[in-house]
Interface confidence: low
């Protein structure tokens, strides 16, 4: 049975709390629900950084910081509709993650 892909969660992992230009940054994107194979795309300021496919556990992407700050997001697509994560904003002083849950209208 096909399972709709859920909205992925993007996690940024840095080697230290105070990140600096040149640091290696690890991006992890995972949709907790979705089948079969999920294609993950990573974005910086809406520009595609790269993509990776995974059956489970999400996907990783590594990059070296070349800018002082920026907005990162990822997208999960299982061929039955894509979902994009909340944007994670990276500052030189650390990470700020913005996520939202359901609300009643």
């Amino acid at each position: 049975v096909a399972v709709p892909v859920s909205r992925p969660v993007l996690t940024l992992r840095a080697p230290r709390a105070q990140v600096a230009v040149g640091d290696l940054l690890e991006l992890h994107c995972e949709a907790l629900r979705g089948s079969p194979l999920i294609l993950y795309q990573f974005y910086h300021e809406d520009v595609t950084l790269g993509n990776s496919s995974a059956l489970s556990g999400g996907a990783f992407f590594n990059l070296s910081l070349t800018a002082e700050h920026g907005n990162y997001s990822c997208e999960a697509d299982n061929g039955l509709g894509a979902q994009r994560s909340e944007t994670v904003t990276l500052y030189l002083t650390g990470l700020t993650e913005n996520r939202s849950g359901p609300v009643a209208t």
Epitope: V1, A2, V3, P4, S6, R7, P8, V9, R33, S73, E75, D77, G79, L80, G81, A82, Q83, R84, E86, R99, S100, G101, P102, V103, T105
Partner: antibody, heavy 118, light 106 residues
């Protein structure tokens, strides 16, 4: 705040087509897929299908495959549902609804009433 | 298609009364979500992920269940709770709703 504004009611003859719209505002339109749901007295709530607001890819309930066409216009942040070859059984309220991270509909449009009458 | 069967279809209750409605799925699902709908309005997300209350939903509401069987309970009915409640599954295509339970004033 998040809003989904749908087009007004439609009174149409059998056999014709109708196109209804759903304008999303108050959020990043391309980050959320849009779904369409039919509500009739006989069948309660029925999922018609969804469209990715970013890619335009669609996924249908097989029951509506030959009835419905879904499109999206990113520039105007509007999703469209076209219903073809209308019959009396297509008379219903049609809702657009935003698909959230939790695999559910978190916001709904106000609904568009389609009445098929000769 | 995963058919969701709600019961009862219509339930009469009085303010202050405890009510429970059920939703049975043909096939096992990870989660059930509940929507509340009042006359001439759109459905509103009420309970998500089986037991979590959506923003603004009173604490007298609760949800439970797993697998094929789920329920929504109102511990003490209030006037504003009279409405139709639909269960919904987003775990598999086609997405499906239950036929609804209408709560009426006794």
């Amino acid at each position: 705040q998040v809003q989904l504004q749908q087009s007004g009611p439609e009174l149409v003859r059998p056999g014709v087509s109708v196109k209804i719209s759903c304008k999303g505002s108050g959020y990043t339109f391309t980050h959320y897929a849009m779904h369409w749901v039919k509500q009739s007295h006989t069948k309660s709530l029925e999922w018609i299908g969804m469209i990715s607001s970013s890619s335009g890819n669609t996924n249908f309930n097989q029951k509506f495959m030959d009835k419905a066409t879904m499109t999206v216009d990113k520039s105007s942040t509007t999703a469209y549902l076209e219903l073809a070859r209308l019959t009396f059984g297509d008379s219903a309220i049609y809702y657009c609804a935003r698909w959230s991270y939790y695999a559910l509909f978190d916001y709904w449009g106000q609904g568009t009433t389609v009445t098929v009458s000769s | 298609e995963n058919v969701l069967t709600q019961s009862p279809a219509i339930m009469s209750a009085s303010p202050g009364e405890k009510v429970t409605m059920t939703c049975s799925a043909d096939s096992s699902v990870d989660y059930i979500h509940w929507y509340q709908q009042k006359s001439n309005t759109s459905p509103k997300l009420w309970i998500y992920d089986t037991s979590k209350l959506a923003s603004g939903v009173p604490g007298r509401f609760s949800g439970s269940g797993s697998g094929n069987s789920y329920s929504l309970t109102i511990s003490s009915m209030e006037a504003e709770d009279f409405a139709t409640y639909y269960c919904f599954q987003g775990s598999g295509y086609p997405l499906t709703f239950g036929s609804g339970t209408k709560l009426e004033l006794k």
